[in-house]
Amino acid sequence: IWELKKDVYVVELDWYPDAPGEMVVLTCDTPEEDGITWTLDQSSEVLGSGKTLTIQVKEFGDAGQYTCHKGGEVLSHSLLLLHKKEDGIWSTDILKDQKEPKNKTFLRCEAKNYSGRFTCWWLTTISTDLTFSVKSSRGSSDPQGVTCGAATLSAERVRGDNKEYEYSVECQEDSACPAAEESLPIEVMVDAVHKLKYENYTSSFFIRDIIKPDPPKNLQLKPLKNSRQVEVSWEYPDTWSTPHSYFSLTFCVQVQGKSKREKKDRVFTDKTSATVICRKNASISVRAQDRYYSSSWSEWASVPCS
Amino acid sequence: RAVPGGSSPAWTQCQQLSQKLCTLAWSAHPLVGHMDLREEGDEETTNDVPHIQCGDGCDPQGLRDNSQFCLQRIHQGLIFYEKLLGSDIFTGEPSLLPDSPVGQLHASLLGLSQLLQPEGHHWETQQIPSLSPSQPWQRLLLRFKILRSLQAFVAVAARVFAHGAATLSP
């Protein structure tokens, strides 16, 4: 058993049919010695008396808010949550496996630049009685500070018969050094509590590996005289790190016909313009990637050829 | 050419060669994104590699003030990786394919380090750790880790030279 926060405790349980329960001794936080009684949750029934209450925690029915009282007055509370371990593996019932980029990916994180700011998100089908708390650091043995905000519900989607809820959090490294080569990964830890179930999820990454630039901005076409060619131009997204002479992007320009089956013409360039042939009913798209490190491409920015 | 304590390097040449290094490093080990090598307990293996750190002056401001600190750090790293790529980690079993980009990568690391430090001038270099994995699978894992680390190192070096070529070239 360990303390998650003031008056909230997590009991770690091996979860198999003939597992013994965990013996927990609750102590009433009071100088009083006599006339103390204990109750659980909303029930007014007395579970025991005395300054300590020894319980066996085996089921979610044993978790909950234990309260000690004296003469009708509440003295203190202890909320017990359960953390299940099945076959030596901590349960992951609360969050959905996103399976990208690999199985058992519960947290996904992205950064728009090298400023040390990043966003993580996760999915669940649970709609109520759910709380998240996020902590982060650079490195784990001698951790350096990363400040995370509160996790918020960022999207709701219908997936077949189920509703899926996306939560996200923004974090900022306290003393980020955008130009340095990272040697210690960022660690992100999410505590998830659903009703009386506690779970924790972690992710470890370098900012460089989670970079995904915003799409190029101000995508424009300029027809070239007496030609089917057009000059496509664009700019670096506002959110990308500066100066651009240092934090450079490379670009992919694509000409795509109306039909998905049509052959796509692709051009790669480090410049912010390119000359391409514009076919009727086609569209031109441009995306960006860090020039020197192969992290994710941005989403496409597109304009129609007409 | 970079002369210790003195003139500027050939920024444009360094830019071109460092960008080539980036391409080679990724073609030598393109699928790293699908393998989380940090899970494989790399404390004793790649923690000794020289990293370009915050105080090394490789940021735009630091380069403007005095690029020599940064260039020395990059040079150290290039020599370190050049030695690693020439060691039995890469020459031993399992053998690299004949058309593997590792050979070119090795040569380009040497080329860039020589651009930064011509014959007769010496910056102190870092000792390479004695890593001699006994098993082929250990060697393979170590190669992945070294290449992964090299990708991050040459990315910073390439940014330095690109910025230098754009803003510090005479």
């Epitope: 049919p17 003939d18 597992a19 013994p20 329960g21 013996m23 927990v24 659980l40 949750d41 909303q42 029930s43 029934e45 579970l47 209450l53 020894t54 319980i55 066996q56 925690v57 085996k58 089921e59 979610f60 029915g61 044993d62 909950g64 234990y66 009703k195 | -």
Partner: antibody, heavy 119, light 107 residues
């Protein structure tokens, strides 16, 4: 006052189905799991299993798994034990009981439902 | 499953006697043991839990002791209403199991 009131005695033929009930009152129904115990004529007590009224989480005695089904209706604070195909060997007194949280033993019991299966 | 063995299976005693019933578990169950009293035609009633804690409303003449594998229920001075069958139950490991019962009769 805590009360667990069980449905009346049943006489059934082999192969028939049956559902007996246990209605709880006088306490917070969702705080306490409900269990069932069998007592065959002239015999001792046998633990069938327990169930959470909150989310229908169930722990069956392996000996009874597949033989009986436990269920619960939160809205009426009622627990159920059912058989899809009774056998003569199911003849017994069945007790529902309230599981004490933080312990696991049964602190309050229903009066019992006698089930007789005979052709 | 954990076997619970009670002894004796039955015993005769008189009002005012001190009576001891023992219960042995086939493996360690800590203090997670309860005692119940059952009278003919009635439901069992909880007497003792956690091996030695008395259920609310149970007279003080009933006491429990023991831990691990050996447990005892003691009635310090038998009363006429105490003649019944007594069961021990372990609630440490699923499935929770009962002893076979001890029938306490009037001598």
């Amino acid at each position: 006052e805590v009360q667990l009131v069980q449905s009346g005695a049943e006489v059934k033929k082999p192969g028939e189905s049956l559902k007996i009930s246990c209605q709880s009152s006088g306490y917070s129904f969702t705080t306490y799991w409900i269990g069932w115990v069998r007592q065959m004529p002239g015999q001792g007590l046998e633990w069938i299993g327990i169930m959470s009224p909150v989310d229908s989480d169930i722990r069956y005695n392996p000996m009874f798994r597949g033989q009986v089904t436990m269920s619960v209706d939160k809205s009426s604070s009622t627990a159920y034990l059912q058989w899809s195909s009774l056998k003569a060997s199911d003849t017994a007194m069945y007790y529902c009981a309230r599981r004490r949280p933080g312990q696991g033993y049964f602190d309050f019991w229903g009066q019992g439902t006698m089930v007789t299966v005979s052709s | 499953d954990i076997q619970m063995t009670q002894s004796p299976s039955s015993l005769s005693a008189s009002v005012g006697d001190r009576v001891t019933i023992t219960c042995k578990a086939s493996q360690n169950v800590g203090s997670w043991l309860a005692w119940y009293q059952q009278k003919p035609g009635k439901a069992p009633k909880s007497l003792i839990y956690s091996a030695s804690s008395r259920q609310s409303g149970v007279p003080s003449r009933f006491s429990g002791s023991g831990s691990g594998t050996d447990f005892t229920l003691t009635i310090s001075s038998l009363q006429p209403e105490d003649f019944a069958t007594y069961y021990c139950q372990q609630y440490d490991i699923y499935p929770f199991t009962f002893g076979q019962g001890t029938k306490l009769e009037i001598k």
